[in-house]
């Protein structure tokens, strides 16, 4: 391509940054940039908090946290001060009433009486069909099974108390969590008399009991955790050294390691070429045709004809002709790519403060979500709450006079009804009142809240990032002319004058992302619906708003690192930072896409590298480690190996933002450098050596050859 | 049809023992429990006890506790009331019930549904 | 134990009247109550169970209803051969106990 076409295209995309003698890196005097957005975001926050107040002033989350019994009085408390359990009748119901949506709503309730007892159950139990005729005495409390609800005569037929749901018809060892009684364990229990295997608590049983292992799984599971614990923080700080080190030595390995990767993808390509080119002669001498498979909805059956593997070597010679000639072509631009990578490991060797501010971020994401969580669910039990009537057997001789979902008084349970089983039970929380009113628009503001801060806080953090990196890149003298605290003086700036670009940012973002939860909640009803075309539209919909997504992201990203360097509000950051990346599009995309593979592969190496080690360690594989370094005996060796990998990789992830925030600040400064600097005395390059001999570029050396630190 | 006879009553003296039987007949005996309620002359109808299908549990009035047995043979489908140290309060006719419930049916529980014609037992000096 | 009163003791009627027989627990015994009708000299009849529920052959002029303490048995139009002595009876809490019994005859 000429020079003067090039020239035109760059023209498109706004003039090149013109020379600045006063610039020297991230600009000190600054003004408070998106003041309007910063007052919007403050009185958002402002408002969050009154909701959270308000939350607090009305909601009970006892009511969802604390476990509560039939009659609505909490266990634990007051007259069930001795009694701090819930145990379920039939906890089978609950499992098979329960969403997310109730649990949210309504605390962990269940259509099965419920009774507070001072301790879960510890043996398996059934009522036998020799005890109907018995007494509940002589069945319940001579037993020590004390688990009927309060004020059951001690005289009473057991059958009775059954079909009433006064006393349960089985027990399950349990164990308390969350202030319930879980059953854990698997134990044959007998065949409950006169329950067919088509009714609730047969299916409960049966269904429950055959997924549990010969021992309490969670026991196992945290015996496994307690036994090795130690080990896995181990691996964790192997995790932690070894994306440190891999970040570290980049800048001496960055180029043949990239090389490497690059025709490792060329290599994978070819060989999936061969073995597309193989998988299709073989079909093509079987006379395998896709004309005589007709269409089909099973994908599987592809694998047998000729055209699947022509087509897929096809896009895999194209794949690997594009990548040769990206190879060839853009050799230049991938020396920049190397180079820059070498130059972002130099920087975060510079700054290593860097590569621990996730943690921060980390810590603010928490706080936001917890305080979301909170406001969530004290609003959610903001209201009175509401008993009806229920019946877990409504057919039942004497249930058909009585109203099913009438309101009732929990403490006035039905105890004389000529229905079996009619119980007050908790419905939910009325929607008296101002508040309650307000609940749903409450909830949304909730969420919103949610989202908004959270990607402010992302954004805070890119922001604080680059202006970190900023100021390494354009110290003209490195390390002496970095400043002392990069990482905190861009903490205080960005916090002190940008809150309110961020804040904009972010609600772009945000209100991309609340549209794409919605559109997801509308799929998520219209799964049912068979329509063609209202999948189509809705897939397209759904695939636009991701790109969109993915494409404000990118934007917000770049604007943050303007932000953080020039101190301009978010609009015009974003449009300097579009037309600037627009201008140097081969390049951006040659980096974007080297990085990627780079961060990829450190991935790999870390989760990988951890893997394999926690492998060899926690199945007892490494032989002759020493007394100290034995493997502990686990129920579940993958457990830990698991716990590892999931760990090693939000580690990696985490150092690889940083670093990827990194490359992509300098990359900016970079191109800033090219268009502002010229390598003249009184306009030097601020880039590295290797950049400059990459570009074939020099700075002119000062009379006194008083030459540049590096 | 499902039938109960009583048999076994008669004049005793106070401090006697007596022993009534209930032959049953049209129904599987050993599935079903069994009562007895007896009716003083002139008065209203008084439960006495009640044996459950397998003979395993037994339940009697407070008045009679101790003093009479509730026992039943599944194989010559039979009820039996062992009735020891006897008293003129005692004086009654004794009726032998069947209970609906037969152990099978977990959901519901009837109670007493057909009755002997009963059998009358005097204690007298 | 518990301790079942019936009112009226007794009541007369004419034939063809609709007749209301109650029958109260000391306690609670939510719908386990059941109806018996006996005639001079016979053994009792059993006429409706669970409060409710009538036996096979019992005629539907019968009905009964209450839970928990209160119970009442009705005839709807009351015929020569239901002049007798209605009992109630609870079996729920052992011992089982009868009402006293309520007689019924022609005015």
């Known amino acids: 391509m000429g020079g003067k076409q090039r020239d035109k295209d760059d023209e498109a995309y706004g003039k090149p940054v013109k020379y600045d003698p006063s610039f020297r890196g991230p600009i000190k005097n600054r003004s408070c940039t998106d003041v309007i957005c910063c007052v919007l975001f403050l009185l958002f926050i402002l408002g969050y908090i009154v909701v959270g107040i308000v939350a607090w002033l009305y909601g009970d989350p006892r009511q969802v946290l604390y476990p509560r019994n039939s009659t609505g009085a909490y266990c634990g408390m007051g007259e069930n001060k001795d009694k701090p359990y819930l145990l379920y009748f039939n906890i089978f119901s609950c499992i098979l009433s329960t969403n997310i949506i109730s649990v949210a709503e309504n605390g962990l309730q269940c259509p099965t009486p419920q009774v507070c007892v001072s301790s879960c159950p510890e043996d398996p139990w059934t009522v036998g069909k020799n005890q109907f005729s018995q007494t509940v005495g002589e069945v319940f409390y001579t037993k020590n099974r004390n688990f009927c609800l309060p004020g059951v005569p001690w005289n009473m037929m057991v059958i009775t108390s059954l079909q009433q749901e006064l006393c349960p018809s089985f027990l399950l060892p349990s164990a308390p969590a969350l202030g319930r009684c879980f059953p854990w364990t698997n134990v044959t229990l007998p065949e409950l008399p006169g329950i067919t295997n088509d009714t609730t608590i047969a299916q409960g049983i049966s269904g429950l009991i055959d997924s549990l292992n010969a021992r309490d799984i969670s026991v196992k599971i945290f015996e496994d955790f307690a036994h090795s614990w130690y080990w896995i923080l181990v691996a964790l700080g192997v995790a932690l050294l070894l994306s440190l080190l891999f970040i570290l030595l980049l800048r001496l390995v960055a180029g043949p390691l990239v090389l490497v990767l690059i025709l490792g993808v060329l290599g994978v390509l070819a060989y999936g070429i061969y073995y597309c080119w193989e998988e299709y002669r073989v079909l093509r001498d079987k006379g395998a045709s896709i004309s005589q498979l007709g269409f089909t909805t099973n994908l599987s059956a592809y694998q047998s004809v000729q055209e699947t593997w022509l087509a897929a070597l096809i896009v895999l010679a194209v794949l690997e002709a594009i990548l040769l000639l990206v190879l060839i072509f853009l050799r230049q631009r991938i020396r920049i790519a190397i180079a820059l990578l070498k130059e972002a490991s130099k920087a975060v060797g510079q700054m290593m403060s860097t590569m621990f501010y996730p943690l921060v971020t980390f810590v603010l994401l928490l706080i936001c979500i917890a305080y979301w969580a909170m406001t969530a669910l004290y609003l959610a039990t903001s209201g009175q709450p509401q008993y009806v009537l229920w019946a877990s057997n409504i057919s039942s001789p004497g249930c058909e006079k009585v109203s099913i979902n009438t309101s009732c008084n929990p403490m006035d349970q039905p105890v004389n009804s000529s229905c079996p089983g009619l119980m007050c039970v908790f419905q939910g929380y009325s929607s008296k009142g101002l508040v309650q009113r307000s609940l749903f628009n409450l909830q949304i503001y909730g969420v919103l809240g949610l989202f908004w801060t959270l990607n402010w806080v992302l954004a805070l953090g890119q922001c604080v990032l680059a202006g970190a990196f900023a100021s390494f890149y354009w110290a003209f003298h490195k390390p002496q002319d970095i400043p002392t605290f990069p990482l905190i003086s861009a903490f205080i700036r960005t916090l002190r004058y940008h809150t309110g670009s961020l804040a904009f940012g972010a609600l772009i973002l945000t209100l991309v992302q609340i549209a794409r939860v919605i559109l997801e909640y509308i799929d998520h009803k219209l799964r049912g619906v068979q329509n063609p075309v209202a999948r189509c539209i809705m897939c397209c919909f759904k695939c636009c708003l991701w790109c969109l997504e993915k494409f404000i992201k990118f934007l917000n990203r770049n604007a943050y690192i303007m932000i953080a360097i020039y101190g301009k509000n978010f609009c015009v950051s974003a449009k300097n930072a579009f037309t600037l990346l627009m201008r140097n599009i081969v390049r951006v995309v040659v980096l974007d896409k080297v990085t990627d593979l780079l961060l990829f592969f450190g991935k790999l190496l870390v989760v990988g590298g951890v893997g394999v080690l926690s492998f060899f360690f926690f199945s007892g594989r490494i032989q002759g480690l020493g007394r100290d370094f034995k493997s502990p005996h686990l129920n579940y060796y993958w457990l830990p190996i698991m716990t590892s990998i999931m760990g090693a990789y939000v580690i990696a992830s985490g150092f690889f933002s940083v670093f990827g925030m990194c490359v992509d600040t300098l990359f900016l400064c970079f191109l800033e450098d090219l268009e502002r600097n010229d390598g003249s005395l009184d306009r030097p390059y601020y880039m590295s050596k290797s950049l400059l001999k990459i570009l074939g570029k020099k700075n002119e050396a000062p009379p006194d050859n008083k030459k540049r630190k590096k | 049809q499902v039938q109960l006879v009583e048999s076994g009553g008669g004049v005793v003296q106070p401090g006697r023992s007596l022993r009534l039987s209930c032959a049953a007949s049209?129904?599987?005996?050993?599935?079903?429990?069994m009562h007895w309620v007896r009716q003083a002359p002139g008065k209203g109808l008084e439960w006495v006890a009640v044996?459950?299908?397998?003979?395993?549990?037994?339940y009697y009035t407070d008045s009679v506790k101790g003093r009479f047995t509730i026992s039943r043979d599944n194989s010559k489908n039979t009820l039996y009331l062992q009735m020891n140290s006897l008293r003129a309060e005692d004086t009654a006719v004794y009726y032998c019930?069947?209970?609906?419930?037969?152990?099978?049916?977990?959901?519901?529980?009837?109670?007493?549904?057909?009755w002997g014609q009963g059998t009358t037992v005097t204690v007298s000096s | 134990d518990i301790q079942m009163t019936q009112s009226p003791s007794s009541l007369s009627a004419s034939v063809g009247d609709r007749v209301t027989i109650t029958c109260r627990a000391s306690?609670?015994?939510?719908?386990?109550l059941a109806w018996f009708q006996q005639k001079p000299g016979k053994a009792p009849r059993s006429l409706i169970y669970?409060?409710?529920s009538l036996h096979s052959g019992v005629p539907s002029k019968f009905s009964g209803s209450g839970s928990g303490t209160d119970f009442t048995l009705t005839i709807s139009s009351l015929q020569p051969e239901d002049f007798a002595t209605y009992y109630c009876?609870?079996?729920?809490?052992?011992?089982?106990?009868f009402g006293p019994g309520t007689k019924v005859d022609i005015k």
């Open positions: 019930a069947r209970d609906r419930y037969s152990g099978y049916d977990y959901f519901y529980y009837y109670g007493m549904d057909v």
């Open positions: 049209g129904f599987t005996f050993s599935s079903y429990g």
């Open positions: 044996i459950w299908y397998d003979g395993s549990n037994k």
């Open positions: 306690q609670g015994i939510y719908n386990y």
């Open positions: 669970a409060a409710s």
């Open positions: 009876q609870q079996y729920t809490i052992y011992p089982f106990t």
